[in-house]
């Protein structure tokens, strides 16, 4: 199920309005074109290091290279969290850390990177060929996951080079899909721009919808779309958030900014409620991995300011991993 925002329809201009509206309507294609060209794909890197002092002790470091704000990091081993992996730690940027043996110490290194020390003794201690995965849930990018392990010939004290992600085996389909959509969008915008030279400036007008239709709704990524791809360790980013155009522009004309519900996302870094300010309508591709973003209109019960966790349409605990921790 995917909820679509109401996208205003293009209408011929009303007589006498071309001059007033022309410069405004020119802005939209250029803004979108710029965003098309600059839209970057976030990445996750994973570094696994065996400590020289304790041969079976590991340090895992993970980082997120993206512009969004991180809402949760999950570190697992034996494969990704949802695909047979076991959760080692869950880190929330404001609420803290839950960790599990053999994790000895999980911590935030920066606002976008974490480290996890695994102790080396006991039945659950890691071995050299163990795969460690880090999943970053961020807004607006969605969930991004990368996995890494020590190379077979690693010397103690050496680390595996950081594994960038989306890793090839995981995100090939997603990258192709994203590229296709972006390419199509950019070509279409160029086409619009070319037409614009030969026609009077069109005026954007909200499409006629029923009064019950919400003006801005979040998207609910399809759970099935990823399963159908059958890619192991996949974090396929295929769900595209429709840009919602704010029809209540104070100057009477349309606004070119996405209208986000103010409780849909908050930066964990500080108290500034950035979601209430206009944000460029970027075609953000979010992971369909765990249905992180659902109906943003439904706020979870007694969730604190700046800490909204996104509800899942299947119920309040449907998004939890094997830990019972989001």
């Amino acid at each position: 199920m995917r909820t679509e925002a109401q996208v205003p329809a293009l209408q011929p201009p009303e007589p006498g309005l071309e001059g007033a509206m022309g410069h405004r309507t020119l802005v939209l294609p250029w803004v979108l074109l710029t965003l098309c060209v600059t839209a970057g794909t976030p990445e996750v890197w994973v570094q696994v290091r065996m400590e020289a002092t304790e041969l079976s002790s590991f340090t895992i470091r993970c980082g997120f290279l993206g512009s969004g704000s991180i809402s949760l990091v999950t570190v697992s081993w034996g494969g990704p969290n949802g695909a047979g992996g076991t959760t080692l730690a869950v880190l929330h940027p404001e609420r803290g850390i839950r960790q599990w043996a053999p994790a000895r110490q999980a911590r935030w290194e920066t606002q976008s990177s974490i480290s996890l020390i695994l102790e080396g003794s006991g039945a659950s201690s890691p071995c050299a060929n163990t795969t460690f995965c880090c999943k970053f849930a961020s807004f607006p990018e969605g969930s991004w996951e990368a996995c890494g392990s020590l190379p077979p010939s690693s010397d103690p004290g050496l680390s595996a080079p950081p594994t960038p992600a989306p890793i090839l085996r995981a995100d090939l389909a997603g990258i192709l899909g994203v590229s296709g959509v972006l390419l199509f969008g950019c070509v279409y915008l160029l086409h619009l721009l070319r037409r614009h030279k030969h026609r009077p400036a069109p005026r954007l007008q909200p499409s006629r919808t029923s009064p019950q239709a919400p003006r801005a709704r979040a998207w609910a990524p399809s759970q099935a779309s990823q399963a159908a791809l059958h890619v192991p360790y996949a974090t396929i980013n295929t769900s595209c958030r429709p840009a919602t155009l704010d029809t209540a522009h104070p100057h009477g004309g349309p606004s070119w900014w996405a209208s986000l519900p103010t409780h849909a996302a908050h930066r964990p870094q500080g108290p500034a409620a950035w979601a209430s300010t206009p944000i460029p309508a970027r075609g953000s591709f979010v992971s369909v991995e765990n249905g992180l973003y659902a109906q943003a209109g439904e706020r979870p019960p007694h969730t604190g300011p700046g800490l909204t966790l996104f509800p899942d349409p299947r119920g309040p605990r449907a998004m939890e991993g094997p830990l019972g921790v989001r």
Partner: antibody, heavy 119, light 107 residues
Framework: EVQLQQSGPELAKPGSSVKISCKAS????????IDWVKESHGKSLEWIGA????????NYNQKFKGKATLTVDKSSSTAYMELRSLTSEDSAVYYC????????????WATGTTVTVSS | DIVMTQSQKFMSTSVGDRVSITCKAS??????VDWYQQKPGQSPKALIF???NRHTGVPDRFAGSGSGTDFNLTIRNVQSEDLADYFC?????????FGGGTKLEIR
């Protein structure tokens, strides 16, 4: 109604072991972690550790490693804590509590089990 | 380990008054602090989670604030049933640690 019901008071001899139970009801047992907390005179409250009923994964406060062992029985929705090699320092009230993973806090507490170690 | 310090072991107040209980963390714990109330002979009960959010059913006389290292629990219009011990807890890092507690006495 969500409830955590703990077993009754224990009187134990130094060097022996006790196993305290914590039976959950009113919710899906595997959806929430169970943590254990010690309340002793002069030491306020101390977090002992946590267990995930889903997979039996544990996390212990280093101070209680070797002292406490956390287990679960999914079929009876019961969490257990075994305390071994008991000394008078282990005389305390022990609580099991439910960790709300949506909001990250201990939302439900059991009534507690008093353990008295005396020869 | 992160040390949570509740400097006031006892606080005395009267019904109808406003009182603030403080808790200081030995390092930055963001907003990963909760407050629990323990009445005599009872188990602890959740009051405030993540620094400032009230647990379900907690009267709005109770309010939490703070982030980083300094946290406050404020009770306004104190009632006789508020006689209890109040503990802060950090879950920013393992092991989770509690403050030493503040006993609220009603004059």
């Amino acid at each position: 109604e969500v409830q955590l019901q703990q077993s009754g008071p224990e009187l134990a001899k130094p060097g022996s072991s006790v196993k305290i139970s914590c039976k959950a009801s009113g919710y899906t047992f595997t959806d929430y972690n169970i943590d254990w907390v010690k309340e002793s005179h002069g030491k306020s409250l101390e977090w002992i550790g946590a267990i995930d009923p889903n997979n039996g994964g544990t996390n212990y406060n280093q101070k209680f490693k070797g002292k406490a062992t956390l287990t679960v029985d999914k079929s009876s929705s019961t969490a257990y804590m075994e305390l071994r090699s008991l000394t008078s320092e282990d005389s305390a009230v022990y609580y099991c509590t439910r960790w709300d993973s949506n909001d990250w806090y201990f939302d439900v507490w059991a009534t507690g089990t008093t353990v008295t170690v005396s020869s | 380990d992160i040390v949570m310090t509740q400097s006031q072991k006892f606080m005395s107040t009267s019904v109808g008054d406003r009182v603030s209980i403080t808790c200081k963390a030995s390092q930055n714990v963001r907003s990963a602090v909760d407050w629990y109330q323990q009445k005599p002979g009872q188990s602890p009960k959740a009051l405030i989670f993540s620094s400032s959010n009230r647990h379900t059913g907690v009267p709005d006389r109770f309010a939490g604030s703070g982030s980083g290292t300094d946290f406050n629990l404020t009770i306004r219009n104190v009632q006789s049933e508020d006689l209890a011990d109040y503990f802060c807890l950090q879950h920013w890092n393992s092991p989770y640690t509690f403050g030493g507690g503040t006993k609220l006495e009603i004059r």
